[in-house]
């Protein structure tokens, strides 16, 4: 804590600025005045304070605004973001996207901390929802935030979301996450037409049921092996061969190579033999 | 460098329960995923059982009712309690980490055999 001492005469900052690097703790905590610093917050990050000066600083905006910061300071603060703790965030509302894409870039290339943890829970709970933006911006700076959502948080994900996300943000998401995700990308993407929908939705059909499955193979799509050995077990098993022929089009022949593995492996066993004879391919039930 | 280590694996009796450990270190502090897969001889990896950032957990259909997934936050560990074991329960039993960033790590892995 800084003790409370006068400015020394002709000291006083008229703006926030370079000289002030060479301020000591106290004499920026007499000096600088808490409102100057909070209209001019985007200087500070041009200027090379020590740690210990931003911990002046951000005691006089903690002094400032007891009750949180303001949008227009949050969104300013740079690398004084890292100062914060969580409950200092816990006290703010955050509702520009804007704001959220700068404080995430100050983290950026790192682990995602408690303070960055604690900014999108509050941001995400000031809008609702997790919108179609929101997720956008999540999952091009943390990869992995989509699939370390759990199932009861996912089901609030909206499916015009479901739109923002990639093949490889899914990549991490188990069994149970995919349940969730799949039928709201099969509403998500309901307009599309069969090669359209099927280049979009194959990414999560690890959570599509029998039905789903069954009326793709109706539709020509040539599932690969990779996506085939993703799907549900409970799903693959009632697929007739004819089905799971259709299904995976020219890549039937790869069954083969994986019949020793599930679901392939427990999808043979239910079916009748000469059916499975008819895909030439020697594989026993 | 994140490093994950399984115990508590061994031999044991259909109908009986054994208790899995998952201890992480290397992670300072991420938004955190831990699951549970296991891999018996001649199949793939399958799911077990996840725990998530918001403590809330999820299962496998088939060890729902029969296995628990918990966490103990002060000693960086995840724990797999199998009950009621069937033999089909026989398998390497491995740990997974993730972090919302994208960082992922396995464990080696611990035997699970159950005889009957």
């Known amino acids: 804590e800084v003790e409370k001492t006068a400015c020394p005469s002709g000291k006083k900052a008229r703006e926030i600025d370079e000289s002030l690097i060479f301020y000591k703790k106290w004499e920026l905590e007499a000096c600088v005045d808490a409102a100057l610093l909070a209209t001019q917050m985007d200087r500070v990050n041009a200027i090379p304070f020590t740690y210990e000066q931003l911990d002046v600083l951000k005691h006089k905006l903690d002094e400032l605004y007891p009750q949180g910061y303001p949008e227009s300071v949050i969104q300013h603060l740079g690398y004084l973001f890292l100062k914060m703790s969580p409950e200092d965030i816990r006290k703010w509302n955050v509702t520009s996207l804007e704001t959220l894409k700068a404080l995430l870039e100050v983290n950026k290339g790192h682990e995602m901390s408690p303070q960055v943890a604690t900014l999108i829970d509050r941001f995400v709970k000031g809008r609702g929802q997790l919108d179609k933006d929101t997720l956008d911006t999540l999952t091009a700076f943390y990869p992995g935030y989509l699939c370390s959502l759990s199932p009861e948080e996912l089901s609030s994900v909206p499916p015009s979301s479901i739109w923002a996300v990639r093949p490889q943000d899914l990549d991490t998401c188990d069994p149970r996450q995919l349940d969730v995700l799949y039928p709201k990308a099969r509403l998500a993407f309901q307009n599309m037409n069969g090669s359209e929908y099927f280049v979009k939705i194959q990414s999560f059909l690890g959570g599509a049921p029998t039905e789903d499955l069954k009326a793709l193979s109706q539709q020509n799509v040539s599932m690969d092996l990779a996506t085939f050995m993703k799907l549900r077990t409970d799903a693959v098993l009632p697929l007739t061969v004819a089905e799971v022929q259709k299904l995976l089009g020219p890549h039937v022949e790869g069954l083969k190579a994986e019949e020793r593995h599930r679901p392939v492996r427990d999808w043979i066993l239910r079916q009748r033999q000469d059916d499975l004879d008819t895909l030439g391919l020697g594989l026993q039930g | 460098q994140v490093h994950l280590m399984e115990s508590g694996g061994g031999s044991v009796q259909a109908g009986g329960s054994l208790r899995l450990s998952c201890a992480r270190s290397?992670?300072?502090?991420?938004?955190?995923?831990m699951r549970w897969y296991r891999q018996a001889p001649g199949s793939e990896r399958e799911f077990v059982s996840a725990?998530?950032?918001?403590?809330?957990?999820a299962y496998a259909d088939s060890v729902k009712g029969r296995f628990t997934m918990s966490q103990d936050d002060a000693k960086n560990t995840v724990y797999l309690q199998m009950n009621s074991v069937k033999p089909e329960d026989t398998a390497m039993y491995y740990c997974?980490?993730?972090?919302?960033?994208?960082?992922?790590?396995w464990g080696q892995g611990t035997q699970v055999t159950v005889s009957s």
């Open positions: 290397g992670v300072t502090y991420c938004r955190l995923t």
């Open positions: 997974k980490l993730n972090c919302a960033s994208g960082l992922t790590a």
């Open positions: 725990i998530y950032s918001d403590g809330s957990t």
